[in-house]
């Protein structure tokens, strides 16, 4: 066979679908690899061919499109399962070709089992809700294209194992689940089950997502530097180890980049000819507020180092702050014994 542009196995598209449910999978060629869409390709006389490799096998084989009730079918650039079976798991390839052109890509499809409480090995998307913020919604994901707009599905929402019905602050509204007010207690997995009829059969789509309640933007503040502060003086003798922690609190802010850094005499530590190490640790509160600690360490401090300016800086989408550490050279204690001896000698 002639050469084919092989994009390999697209592991970025690790597709997971539930057993015994419909699944529609678009050929990734048109979404990620080629600059034209299926309609253009089709008009140009290109044909889309599907085949697969079963789990734990090496042999590529054609997909059987002649199963009872058209269980597997192809429509334009979409491969349909109505419904999936566990042994549909494998690597699927879509190939676009004519006599002069060929391009193909493979992707893994995993058919996953779920229990009666919707627990499964499925990787769940995370939706963040602001704490005590007012109405926010989550939407039943990835159900477009399964049924025409003329079909009115029934949608049932669950939190964990429990149907959401007259929940205190959560209202099911079709494809949406409205949170009148969100609390930490609303953290968890939410499942929508969409039931729709098709050709005399009833199909179910199960979609689960994780809700994480995070700090509200109305409570967000610029970074707060807890350390260094005015109450602590770092007093060292030359030769001792100097350790200065910079501890900064960041309010949760969606898509904000939180940064902490030290400057020594106005320069980055890497640009100063001294042996400095900086270790960072990060902790999060239940609402994903963040505390970052960067410890600046100089193993054997010199008297020159003790005269330098050490400033901790922090930045988030809410603003930038800085705080200098008070560093001093320890003054040797007066040698009282000698002075007293001199005193006695004078009498």
């Amino acid at each position: 066979s002639e050469r084919c542009d092989d994009w390999g196995l697209d592991t970025m598209r690790q597709i997971q679908v539930f057993e015994d449910e419909p699944a529609r999978i678009k050929c990734p060629l048109f979404e990620h690899f080629l600059k034209f869409n299926y309609s253009t390709a089709h008009s140009a006389g290109l044909t889309l061919i599907w085949y697969w490799t079963r789990q734990d096998r090496d042999l590529e084989e054609p997909i059987n499109f002649r199963l009872p009730e058209n269980r597997i079918s192809k429509e334009k650039d979409v491969l349909w399962f109505r419904p999936t079976l566990l042994n549909d798991t494998g690597n699927y390839t879509c190939m676009l070709r004519n006599t002069t052109y060929c391009s193909k890509v493979a992707f893994p499809l995993e058919v996953v089992q779920k229990d009666s409480c919707f627990n499964s090995p499925m990787k769940l998307p995370v939706h963040k809700l602001y704490i005590e913020y007012g109405i926010q919604r989550i939407t039943c994901p990835n159900v477009d294209g399964y049924f025409p707009s003329s079909v009115k599905p029934t949608i049932t929402w669950y939190m964990g194992c429990y149907k959401i019905q007259n929940f205190n602050n959560v209202i099911p509204e079709g494809m949406n689940l409205s949170f009148l007010i969100a609390f930490i207690s609303n953290n968890g997995n939410y499942t929508c089950v969409v039931t729709y009829p098709e050709n005399g059969r009833t199909f179910h789509l199960t979609r689960t997502l994780t809700v994480k309640v995070v700090g509200s933007p109305k409570n967000a503040v610029p970074p707060v530097i807890h350390s260094p502060n005015d109450h602590v003086v770092y007093e060292k003798e030359p030769g001792e180890e100097l350790l200065i922690p910079c501890t900064v609190y960041f309010s949760f802010l969606m898509d904000s980049r939180n940064e902490v850094w030290w400057t020594i005499d106005g320069k980055k530590p890497d640009d100063i000819p001294i042996d400095v190490t900086i270790n960072e640790s990060i902790s999060h509160s239940r609402t994903e507020d963040e505390t970052r600690t960067q410890i600046l360490s100089i193993k054997k401090v010199t008297s020159e180092d003790l005269k330098r300016s050490y400033v901790c800086h922090a930045r988030s989408a809410k603003g930038e702050v800085a705080k200098a550490a008070t560093v001093k050279q320890k003054v040797p204690a007066p040698r009282y014994t000698v002075e007293l001896a001199c005193g006695f000698g004078a009498t």
Epitope: E132, I135, Q165, N168, I171, E173
Partner: antibody, heavy 120, light 110 residues
Framework: EQSGGGAEGGLVKPGGSLELCCKA??????????RCWVRQAPGKGLEWIGC?????????YYANWVNGRFTLSRDIDQSTGCLQLNSLTAADTAMYYC???????????WGQGTLVTVSS | ALVMTQTPSPVSAAVGGTVTINCQAS??????LAWFQQKPGQPPKLLIY???TLASGVPSRFSGSGSGTEFTLTISGLQSDDAATYYC????????????FGGGTEVVVK
Amino acid sequence: EQSGGGAEGGLVKPGGSLELCCKASGFSLSTSYWRCWVRQAPGKGLEWIGCIYAGSGDVTYYANWVNGRFTLSRDIDQSTGCLQLNSLTAADTAMYYCASGVGFGYFNLWGQGTLVTVSS
Amino acid sequence: ALVMTQTPSPVSAAVGGTVTINCQASEDIYSNLAWFQQKPGQPPKLLIYDASTLASGVPSRFSGSGSGTEFTLTISGLQSDDAATYYCLGVYTHISADNAFGGGTEVVVK
């Protein structure tokens, strides 16, 4: 259950203000619930005013027609909710009920109501 | 804003009979509807929530059905004690959280 409509209500002049309060005794203090207010003009139907979440004074919802004239508040320690009525007109003459429920809008505990008459 | 329309009013039936009250929502409110009963001089009493779930202590002769924009309250085996005004309450959160009562339906027991 729920103690009466709270404030004694009574006669208020047009343009005047009044605060109605009621105390819920059918919920434990640890329970989160909605405290809502509903009014009923003489011989008319029920009209929803608004709701406040008893666990958080920050979250309140009002009917569109309220237009900032009424304010809901709550004192979580005393399990008391209040409705501040401002810029009152004769059209605000009604029986004002406080109602509570674990579900938003599903009020299973009601106060006996407070009659507010706005007249010069 | 959400508008709830109730029909008919008044409605009358004999003891032991069946009464059906309809409630129509101006928006799709899914199953977010409650029914209340109010007798003269008393506060309302919750009968049904989530369109069809019976509230605690409510006799099974009361039933609710419907979803979306059309809802029904049915009282079968009517008793003289059921003479009251019945209100539907819709819950809608499209822009802000909004509750709206229907205009009420008076039930007369003959």
